[in-house]
Amino acid sequence: QPPPPPPDATCHQVRSFFQRLQPGLKWVPETPVPGSDLQVCLPKGPTCCSRKMEEKYQLTARLNMEQLLQSASMELKFLIIQNAAVFQEAFEIVVRHAKNYTNAMFKNNYPSLTPQAFEFVGEFFTDVSLYILGSDINVDDMVNELFDSLFPVIYTQLMNPGLPDSALDINECLRGARRDLKVFGNFPKLIMTQVSKSLQVTRIFLQALNLGIEVINTTDHLKFSKDCGRMLTRMWYCSYCQGLMMVKPCGGYCNVVMQGCMAGVVEIDKYWREYILSLEELVNGMYRIYDMENVLLGLFSTIHDSIQYVQKNAGKLTTTIGKLCAHSQQRQYR
Amino acid sequence: SAYYPEDLFIDKKVLKVAHVEHEETLSSRRRELIQKLKSFISFYSALPGYICSHSPVAENDTLCWNGQELVERYSQKAARNGMKNQFNLHELKMKGPEPVVSQIIDKLKHINQLLRTMSMPKGRVLDKNLDEEGFESGDCGDDEDECIGGSGDGMIKVKNQLRFLAELAYDLDVDDAPGNSQQATPKDNEISTFHN
């Protein structure tokens, strides 16, 4: 083994290095001392370190470690944070466009329905946005509410324009009839299936991204144990006590220390890998009815089809509803 | 009385969604994100090595510090902790993860379960399985648009796949992130608390 270089007879170099860490020189001995009170940088001979310096080194070592960890995760953190924000905004844009398309469809094809239809469409898409953001709303209920609200207007404005506007009594009956008679055919069920599947996937996708941010934030701000602090101090700073200012830790030794310090963090690895692969699988499946962009931007067309279906079956429906809701209508005409 | 089919499609306005030079859809954006995330798949297992390579370690020097003394870089002593008896590395590993790490692992397990459930072929209706489940991008004449309204000029044209990025206030390329492409790595510019 090569002999160590002679220690700094005056601890002058150590003092000038230590001063950068801790202005004020009172902790650095003038000349090497026995260092019997040291707990980490146990000396083999005289040392230029004091107990106070050792504590400062430990603090600095843990701080260095935290900074290194944060710089290691910076790019990953930025990637997920940016994407989570962009996707959330993009999904809101999709919802806004879907609402506009649906309103435009009503305005162009069914102008007599517009004031009320706009209101119902607006409520529906507000619920869609809330659902994506994690609100506890049932998608089937949202779709049912949309069709329940639309049908009385379609019935009174398109199918039976002779009815007075104050059809509050008949409205309740019509809402009930809408489901019992499957007035819109299988379109509501179709929309429920498509919307619930695509929104569920979208919501989980956003949740997963947000959890990704939480994972990085958690590991980013880990506080390292005292034991780890001692090992880091010994690796990075104990050489200074011997006046070996320019010496660096051995690579293998660094790896051993880091594995020890990060044993807990590394346990995340298995689940992190699975997270990325599961997210990839989800993304690969986000097409057709699992793609909210596709589903929501096509909703106006399916709603249009559903109204056409009602209109084309208007004769049969009007007769059946006339019988079913006759009581409500009579009360109303009185 | 029935609703007469004279001309259902009155409005002559054409609604066009954002024109974007680089036509980018949500699905391409998602795939791009996954590709970038996959480059971080070993992030946690590689952390110890990453931190060592970004903190001062002896690379070209003949001698290096093993925690206790100066040794030759390739000697057996170089990889060993010079002060084995002071406290045990193995013990440190055995302590297990911190409570916050255990908590985040539980959350990861839960989301992974959810993600798997959503991606399960079993949990999915095969595209054409149900009468009512088929759904693809629409069409409008020859140009892959969907139309609101009927034929002729009374329709509203809609881009079927939103070219959404044009509407976002910022571009998302991680490569262009501040301090990202030319990020000064601690290797070149050590964190100020290292004095070498």
Partner: antibody, heavy 119, light 107 residues
């Protein structure tokens, strides 16, 4: 102008299946339902069912459930009808027709496809 | 399903004459009825919907009337191109049904 172009005549063995096509042009395919109608030579017309191309939602005459399957391909603006387990009773001319959008009356018809089932 | 009964099954007439074809339904369908003309080897052509509204491009010599269960199609001053088969169809709701047809022949 609106046109519905149907595929050519089919000769099939009993028990076999045939798939007829109806290519639409001159209008937005996804904005209207397409119905299929059967006409046995020299006889009346029978409504088989309809498909809404956008959502591929289908509605059948009970009599033809299990016999006919309606599908649509939006990319080619084509509607299809598959007839399976063919018997001599399925020998007929089959028409596709487009309705007005809000009334079940058919303003536009394909030229018809003759299906002959014979051993 | 709604039954459609057309009469007569066939009739002969000359150019210039006026003819009436009738259609009876098994239940009240209000005005939800359409009439079609079909020539040999061709597809049907819509003449009338909603019992009395003429489809686009249909000559005014054709007229539809009736409501409830009784409907008729009247052709004034028959033209050579008017000969062929005529079908009624209700558009009251699915399933749609057609009459058996009336064959109009040149006398």
């Amino acid at each position: 102008q609106v046109q519905l172009q149907q595929s050519g005549a089919e000769l099939a063995r009993p028990g076999a299946s045939v798939k007829l096509s109806c290519k639409a042009s001159g209008y937005t395919f996804t904005s209207y339902g397409i119905s299929w109608v059967k006409q046995i030579t020299g006889q009346g017309l029978e409504w088989i069912g309809e498909i809404y191309p956008r959502s591929e939602s289908t509605y059948y005459n009970e009599k033809f459930k299990g016999k006919a399957t309606l599908t649509a391909d939006k990319s080619s603006s084509t509607a299809y009808m598959e007839l399976r387990s063919l018997t001599s009773e399925d020998s007929a001319v089959y028409f596709c027709a487009r309705d007005y959008g809000n009334i079940y009356s058919f303003a536009y018809w394909g030229q018809g496809t003759l299906v002959t089932v014979s051993a | 399903d709604i039954q459609m009964t057309q009469s007569p099954a066939s009739l002969s007439a000359s150019v210039g004459e006026t003819v009436t074809i009738t259609c009876r339904t098994s239940e009240n369908i209000y005005s939800y009825l359409a009439w079609y003309q079909q020539k040999q080897g061709k597809s049907p052509q819509l003449l009338v919907y909603n019992a009395k509204t003429l489809a686009e491009g249909v000559p005014s010599r054709f007229s539809g009337s009736g409501s409830g269960t009784q409907f008729s199609l009247k052709i004034n001053s028959l033209q050579p191109e008017d000969f062929g088969s005529y079908y009624c169809q209700h558009h009251y709701g699915t399933p749609l049904t057609f009459g058996a047809g009336t064959k109009l022949e040149l006398k």
